[in-house]
Interface confidence: low
Amino acid sequence: AELFLIASPSHPTEGSPVTLTCKMPFLQSSDAQFQFCFFRDTRALGPGWSSSPKLQIAAMWKEDTGSYWCEAQTMASKVLRSRRSQINVHRVPVADVSLETQPPGGQVMEGDRLVLICSVAMGTGDITFLWYKGAVGLNLQSKTQRSLTAEYEIPSVRESDAEQYYCVAENGYGPSPSGLVSITVRIPVSRPILMLRAPRAQAAVEDVLELHCEALRGSPPILYWFYHEDITLGSRSAPSGGGASFNLSLTEEHSGNYSCEANNGLGAQRSEAVTLNFTVPTGARSNHLTS
């Protein structure tokens, strides 16, 4: 009796399953009790001897390329051996490499975590991923793994991490680079300082009081809100950073606490309150403000 080894599929792609079948064309295996064993080169595969004429291999890799055969043994200890079959495992070269960021869009707050995710649309086997900083290419890290994506993490982003990044994927067919991704580091506003500026030391009713609010740190644009007690007076924008001012024509109702808030979309910070009180100087006919 003759024995054949059939691999299905016969030309597998890396990562895909393969079924090996040990066939006896002129003998029904049910006619006699057989045990089967599958080999690659000189090594037995799977469970060794088994009553099943099939062996399922869950995933084939490039290194599984080789010469396979099977043996069948009867109860009478007669051993049949198949001819060798060459199985070539096909590797798919990496293609369509892309670099994405988490958070998306490449905008990240100072101190936050930034993840650079390198992905390939196709590619099999062990893929080496490499991350580079700057168009010139300072190598940051490399990882080799059997997956289509890999991550490089900056746990706490600093201002100096604002740069262009790219990644390269390679699985034996030459490196394939991604496009450049720009990282913008957004800096939250610091607590603003509110200054009250009047045309004279003792501001009087109808004087123009300037409320100047400034956050010393923070990515522009910065929106400043001005408050009297809990009431919004208005807002001013500082498109390029720096401070902003709000003018008030003074009346008696302007006594009380003033504060301002700076907001650049990364959370808001409120200033300490500045208290403005009316005082009536002895012998004076008009009210004056003191802060």
Epitope: D230, I231, T232, L233, S249, E261, G265, A268, R270
Partner: antibody
Framework: QVQLVQSGAEVKKPGASVKVSCKAS????????MHWVKQAPGQGLEWIGR????????KYNEKFKSKATITVDKSTSTAYMELSSLRSEDTAVYYC??????????WGQGTLVTVSS | DIVMTQSPDSLAVSLGERATMNCKSS????????????LAWYQQKPGQSPKLLIY???TRESGVPDRFSGSGSGTDFTLTISSLQAEDVAIYYC????????FGQGTKVEIK
């Protein structure tokens, strides 16, 4: 979209305390102050107090100063109001509400607190 | 505290007719520095949370039908529903935010 989701109804005995939560989503929690409003059964709306989630600073209606304590947890974008020494007149629906330039533009669904022996 | 007084307490209007309600504050709500009136109007339907309709006395909140309008300045304010719809049955509250917030007692709007 902006959402304020409050904790469920509570039944408490006189003298007990209750803590109502209000989880905010869909906006930057620290940008907007959060107010709490009481509505007794069949009655109108009464302001309890407010908190600035950014600084944690709070202010109260004089009437509720010894009754309510408002706090926030910035990490979970949640505001809380604790009512202490509960009495039958504290039975009401309590709302959290976000304030935008003074006006209360988004409201929670309300939490009914029933005080009964 | 600023006291807000609404009138009438209840109002019955036919569908498609105009509904007008008033709100009076014990102090002026007009803030001289920005010429804004610190007053809002809310609608509360049975079993629901209040909903902001109008702020700055006359600015309609996004998504609010244009049949709702607010007017007035200083201490006297009006909310008008130009053509009452069945879904407008509710209690309407005015609220000042010139100081720590206070609400009017509400005006109940029903269909005649």
């Amino acid at each position: 979209q902006v959402q304020l989701v409050q904790s469920g109804a509570e039944v408490k005995k006189p003298g007990a305390s209750v803590k109502v939560s209000c989880k905010a989503s869909g906006y930057t929690f620290t940008r907007y102050w959060m107010h709490w409003v009481k509505q007794a059964p069949g009655q109108g709306l009464e302001w309890i107090g407010r908190i600035d989630p950014n600084s944690g600073g709070s202010k109260y209606n004089e009437k509720f100063k010894s009754k309510a304590t408002i706090t926030v947890d910035k990490s979970t974008s949640t505001a809380y109001m604790e009512l202490s020494s509960l009495r039958s007149e504290d039975t009401a629906v309590y709302y959290c509400t976000r304030v935008n330039s003074g006006a209360m533009d988004y409201w929670g669904q309300g939490t009914l607190v029933t005080v009964s022996s | 505290d600023i006291v807000m007084t609404q009138s009438p307490d209840s109002l019955a209007v036919s569908l498609g007719e105009r509904a007008t309600m008033n709100c009076k504050s014990s102090q002026s709500l007009l803030y001289s520095s920005n010429q804004k009136n610190y007053l809002a109007w809310y609608q509360q339907k049975p079993g629901q949370s209040p909903k902001l309709l109008i702020y700055w006395a006359s600015t309609r909140e996004s998504g609010v039908p244009d049949r709702f309008s607010g007017s007035g300045s200083g201490t006297d304010f009006t909310l008008t529903i130009s053509s009452l719809q069945a879904e407008d049955v509710a209690i309407y509250y005015c609220q000042q935010y010139s100081n720590y917030p206070t609400f009017g007692q509400g005006t109940k709007v029903e269909i005649k």
